[in-house]
Interface confidence: low
């Protein structure tokens, strides 16, 4: 999946299996990726396990888990908040749209999660105090969780260059440049751009994600995975000014 | 857990926190908040002792209090009740506090935490 | 050197509560969260619950719940778990361990034990 | 009873290997990241040998390695000595369970 980090980085990871995204003192949150095609390198998130830890007076410990076709709106024990705390309303779930789109409003530590799912796979999203992020047991042992330290770099798609590369090329792109098989020949170049255009007129990242994904997959729902993950963006980033992002921002994994 | 400073963080964050904004950074009730503060840290130090949040607190407090000019004698205040910052962007309003601390029990300094964003979609 | 000491063994009769101490040195008892695990005789391991001394924040498991209690006294770098309405099957060994990363994932140093025997 | 299955016992002669499974289910096992093992003599505390599936701590020989193929996470001693002889517990936490296996002792034959 593609992948922005707490510090703005933009990625696309091929992680296959559970990795966790965020893992502090309050949350944590893990994903199960899969391959998008049989042998594809790219994956998505098909599932997503979140857990809020019982914190003081306020709320109990409450697991959050989604699936491929099961976006409930509760929490796995069939409650909506924090239980029977004197605080638990400051956990809250919300749905959206039946089986689509979920927020979950964590108040005590100031968070918002919003979980969507588009086509077949999830997307997450969340807004989060620093200080949250930054309260863990200890620094030294933190492992590697992508919100914070990126994907290793060896399991980064480069996919700006496969971008570059299948520019103007049609449906006759090179293989190489692919890292998934072929996806279907009726879906060339120019068709992939003029979907994601529709959706996304900036030409940032998300833009090239989409096309990226189109390009990939065949599959048009990943448009609107583009198109939701930056109505998020705007929704939850702090700073207005970096709702888009552009290649020049493109970093380097964390250590 | 004995240490009681997330209870004085939480009162130093709604002493702070007015209808408006944070109180103005010059003003005595900021400093008389600080020295509030302050006090709550002394108290509950000896139950403290290594606590990340306490020592954080603490070297904090100092900080503000030079970087504001506040004497470390002279008057207290007590927490008020905090409401939410009138309309403006609904994402900061509905994220803020509530009058019960557990609507952000974690804040140290700021009243207005900087917040992080990240995310995860397609392949 | 890390090291975690357990209080000494204790007898108690059905329906009392017993606390068992767990003194943490060579570490900063803040920066790792306590695991409490149990051993029956001749039984496996069972996991009993988590404790952060950094925030108080606790995890039982679930079928403990209610009659578990972790706390800890950071002036003292020492953990506690209370247990309560004692009956025959609480007999075993019961360890502390500090939590390597994380509340869950490992627990990578682990106290002596102390054998709790309930008994009539 | 234990949610993850491991067998109750192995055997095998010095210098051989031997490999003990656990078997849980996709959220125990399969999806999670934090399958440990744990080591441990009669009488004595358990000993953290493998974390994070295959993570071996300092100190703990390298005979000892992890692995985990669907919903079985597998701990392999190649190399088998005396020493080796003890109880090994798996222990996962993924989501909402946390929970140990029910323990295979290992005997040096």
């Known amino acids: 999946p593609h992948l922005r980090t707490f510090t703005d980085r933009f990625q696309t990871c091929k992680v296959q299996g559970a990795w966790p995204l965020i893992d502090n003192n309050y949350l944590n949150v893990q994903v199960t990726n899969t391959p998008v095609l049989p042998g594809s390198a790219a994956t998505a998130t098909s599932k997503l396990t979140i857990i809020f830890k019982n914190f003081q007076e306020c709320v109990d410990q409450k697991v959050y888990q989604a699936e491929m076709d099961e976006l409930p709106a509760a929490f796995v024990d069939g409650s909506k908040n924090g239980g029977d705390k004197h605080g638990a309303n400051s956990l809250k779930i919300t749905e959206k749209v039946s089986g689509q789109h979920v927020e979950i409003r964590a108040k005590y530590i100031g968070t918002t999660i919003v979980v969507r799912q588009v086509g077949r796979y999830l997307t997450f999203a969340v807004r989060v105090p620093e200080e949250v992020v930054n309260a863990v047991e200890d620094w030294d042992s933190q492992g590697l969780y992508l919100c914070l330290r990126g994907c290793p770099l060896n399991q980064q798609i480069d996919f700006q260059a496969f971008h570059t590369n299948t520019e103007g090329t049609g449906a006759r792109r090179l293989a190489a440049a692919s890292p998934a098989p072929t996806a279907p020949e009726t879906f060339p170049y120019e068709t992939a751009v003029a979907k994601c255009k529709e959706k996304l007129p900036v030409e940032d990242l998300y833009y090239q994600a989409c096309v990226f994904d189109l390009l990939t997959t065949g599959d048009v729902n990943f448009t609107l995975a583009a198109y939701y993950a930056l109505e998020d963006v705007k929704m939850l980033h702090s700073n207005k000014d970096k709702l888009h992002l552009y290649e020049r921002t493109r970093d380097l994994p964390g250590r | 857990s004995p240490c009681k400073i997330l209870k004085c963080n939480s009162e130093f964050w709604s002493a702070t926190s007015g209808s408006h904004a944070p109180a103005s950074d010059d003003t005595p009730e900021f400093c008389a908040a600080l020295r509030s503060y302050a006090l709550c840290t002394r108290r509950t130090a000896r139950t403290c002792r290594g606590d990340l949040a306490y020592h954080s607190a603490v070297h904090g407090i100092e900080d503000l209090m030079s970087q504001h000019n506040c004497s470390k004698d002279g008057p207290t205040s007590q927490p008020r009740l905090h409401t939410l910052p009138p309309a403006g962007d609904s994402q900061e309003r509905s994220d803020s506090p509530e009058i019960c601390h557990c609507e952000k029990s974690f804040h140290k300094h700021s009243a207005t935490p900087n917040y992080t964003h990240c995310g995860l979609f397609g392949d | 050197e890390v090291q975690l000491v357990q209080s000494g063994a204790e007898v108690k009769k059905p329906g009392a509560s017993v606390k068992v101490s767990c003194k943490a040195s060579g570490y900063t008892f803040t920066s790792h969260g306590i695991s409490w695990v149990r051993q029956a005789p001749g039984q496996g391991l069972d996991w009993m619950g988590w404790i952060s001394p950094y925030s108080g924040n606790t995890n039982y498991a679930q079928k403990l719940q209610g009659r578990v209690t972790m706390t800890t006294d950071t002036s003292t770098s020492t953990a506690y778990m209370e247990l309560s309405s004692l009956r025959s099957e609480d007999t075993a060994v019961y360890y502390c361990?500090?939590?390597?990363?994380?509340?869950?994932?490992?627990?990578?140093?682990w106290g002596q034990g102390t054998l709790v025997t309930v008994s009539s | 009873q234990s949610a993850l299955t491991q067998p109750r016992s192995v055997s095998g002669s010095p210098g051989q290997s031997v490999t003990i499974s656990c078997t849980g289910t996709s959220s125990s096992v399969g999806d999670s990241i934090y399958v440990s093992w744990y080591q441990q003599h009669p009488g004595k505390a358990p000993k953290l040998m493998l974390y994070d599936v295959t993570k071996r701590p300092s100190g703990v020989p390298d005979r000892f390695s992890g692995s985990k193929s669907g919903n079985t996470a597998s701990l392999t001693i190649s190399g088998l000595q005396a020493e080796d002889e003890a109880d090994y517990y798996c222990y996962s936490y993924a989501g909402t369970d946390t929970l140990f296996g029910g323990g295979t002792k290992v005997t040096v034959l």
């Open positions: 361990a500090r939590v390597g990363s994380g509340p869950y994932y490992y627990m990578d140093v």
